[in-house]
């Protein structure tokens, strides 16, 4: 369960891949498309509002008799639209929705190799947002393997301005 309905904090950031490609969002035919691309030097990076929530995973899951706390995040590149996991299609999509947000909009945040992060589906543990063929997709990661696979690593570059919703 997510502790409380309010985020503990929010930040505005641009999102890029481990290989420094930008995650961009474009409105096409009344819906948003998500792209992974090299940006021209003069082009401004798209902003994403990250809202951070605390989530409790019960001791039965954590296996240690202690309720472990996880950090969950929602990602919103424009007002009323959130990134969501489509587990059936193994895709990452932008959907317009109202609060309370569906579970598909929540991702467990993992810090990895210094200042990289990865986003694990709340609805499908072991499945992460990743890069596939210049698009975002859902990628299954075997926990016995190294979780540092570059295609699920992202960099957050915080944009220091007041955290009101953008656009």
């Amino acid at each position: 369960s997510i502790t409380g309905i309010s985020p503990i904090t929010e930040s505005l950031a641009s999102l890029s891949t481990y290989n420094d490609q930008s995650i961009t969002f474009a409105l096409e035919d009344e819906s948003y498309e998500i792209y992974v691309e090299d940006l021209k030097k003069d082009k401004k990076k798209d902003k994403v509002l990250l809202s951070y929530y605390e989530s409790q995973h019960p001791s039965s899951e954590s296996g240690d008799g202690v309720d472990g706390k996880m950090l969950m995040v929602t990602l919103s590149p424009t007002k009323d639209f959130w990134l969501q996991a489509n587990n059936k299609e193994h895709s990452v999509e932008l959907h317009k929705c109202e609060k309370p947000l569906p579970d598909q909009a929540f991702f467990v945040l993992h810090n990895r190799s210094f200042n990289c992060v990865s986003f694990e589906c709340k609805t499908d543990p072991g499945v992460f947002i990743g890069v596939k063929d210049n698009h975002l997709a859902l990628i299954k990661v075997d926990y016995s393997e190294n979780l540092g696979s570059e295609n699920i690593l992202f960099k957050l570059s915080e944009i220091l301005e007041h955290h009101h919703h953008h656009h």
Partner: antibody, heavy 122, light 107 residues
Framework: EVQLVESGGGLVQPGGSLRLSCAAS????????MSWVRQAPGKGLEWVAS????????YYADSVKGRFTMSRDNSKNTLYLQMNSLRAEDTAVYYC???????????????WGRGTLVTVSS | DIQMTQSPSSVSASVGDRVTITCRAS??????LAWYQQKPGKAPTLLIY???SLQTGVPSRFSGSGSGTDFTLTISSLQPEHFATYYC?????????FGGGTKVEIK
């Protein structure tokens, strides 16, 4: 209840070695990022090394890189810090500390051991 | 590495006083700042995380605020058990870095 208990500290000559242990109870160590933080007598807190809960690491402060090695034994639920080529400036109380969040270091350290004193002197 | 500068380095106060400690980061750390209390001969204990969230079991006399580069820890009414040293720590970027500490002493 979460408990972290350090051991292995003591008096050692410059150039010598020590191995610190941090035994955890009440948590599964492998689920969390863990760090070693030290405090020289009368001074502030200094980060030494970390292993991430989500994989990655260990990572070391420049002041100890190449001399200290951090590891964990999941079967014993214990964290280690192997300290070689010790110097007088390594004299400090060494604490092990647990990340507040499973998988993320953004929340700081919510549990600390009591610390073990390492004195490097001839 | 991000440098954390705490001020003042020490403060003398009386029971019941309101005490404010500030922490400044050398670059923006959004809200990923933690505050710790440390008593002599003891390990630090977490008071505040994410700049303003109170750790479980910590009295509400403690509060934190700020984002970006400037942060504040406030003790609204100082109690005898609050005389200690307080440290801030940025948790936004690796490696974690601590402020130099603020010693709260009895006036």
């Amino acid at each position: 209840e979460v408990q972290l208990v350090e051991s292995g500290g003591g008096l050692v000559q410059p150039g010598g070695s020590l191995r610190l242990s941090c035994a955890a109870s009440g948590i599964t160590l492998s689920s969390y990022g863990m760090s070693w933080v030290r405090q020289a007598p009368g001074k502030g807190l200094e980060w030494v090394a970390s292993i991430f809960g989500s994989g990655g690491g260990p990572y070391y402060a420049d002041s100890v890189k190449g001399r200290f090695t951090m590891s964990r034994d999941n079967s014993k639920n214990t964290l280690y810090l192997q300290m070689n080529s010790l110097r007088a400036e390594d004299t400090a109380v060494y604490y092990c500390a647990k990340d507040r969040y499973s998988g993320s270091y953004y929340g700081g350290f919510d549990y600390w051991g009591r610390g073990t004193l390492v004195t490097v002197s001839s | 590495d991000i440098q954390m500068t705490q001020s003042p380095s020490s403060v003398s106060a009386s029971v019941g006083d309101r005490v404010t400690i500030t922490c400044r980061a050398s670059q923006g750390i959004t809200s990923w700042l933690a505050w710790y209390q440390q008593k002599p001969g003891k390990a630090p204990t977490l008071l505040i995380y994410a700049a303003s969230s109170l750790q479980t079991g910590v009295p509400s006399r403690f509060s934190g605020s700020g984002s970006g580069t400037d942060f504040t820890l406030t003790i609204s009414s100082l109690q005898p058990e609050h005389f200690a040293t307080y440290y801030c720590q940025q948790a936004n970027s690796f490696p974690p870095t601590f402020g130099g500490g603020t010693k709260v002493e009895i006036k």
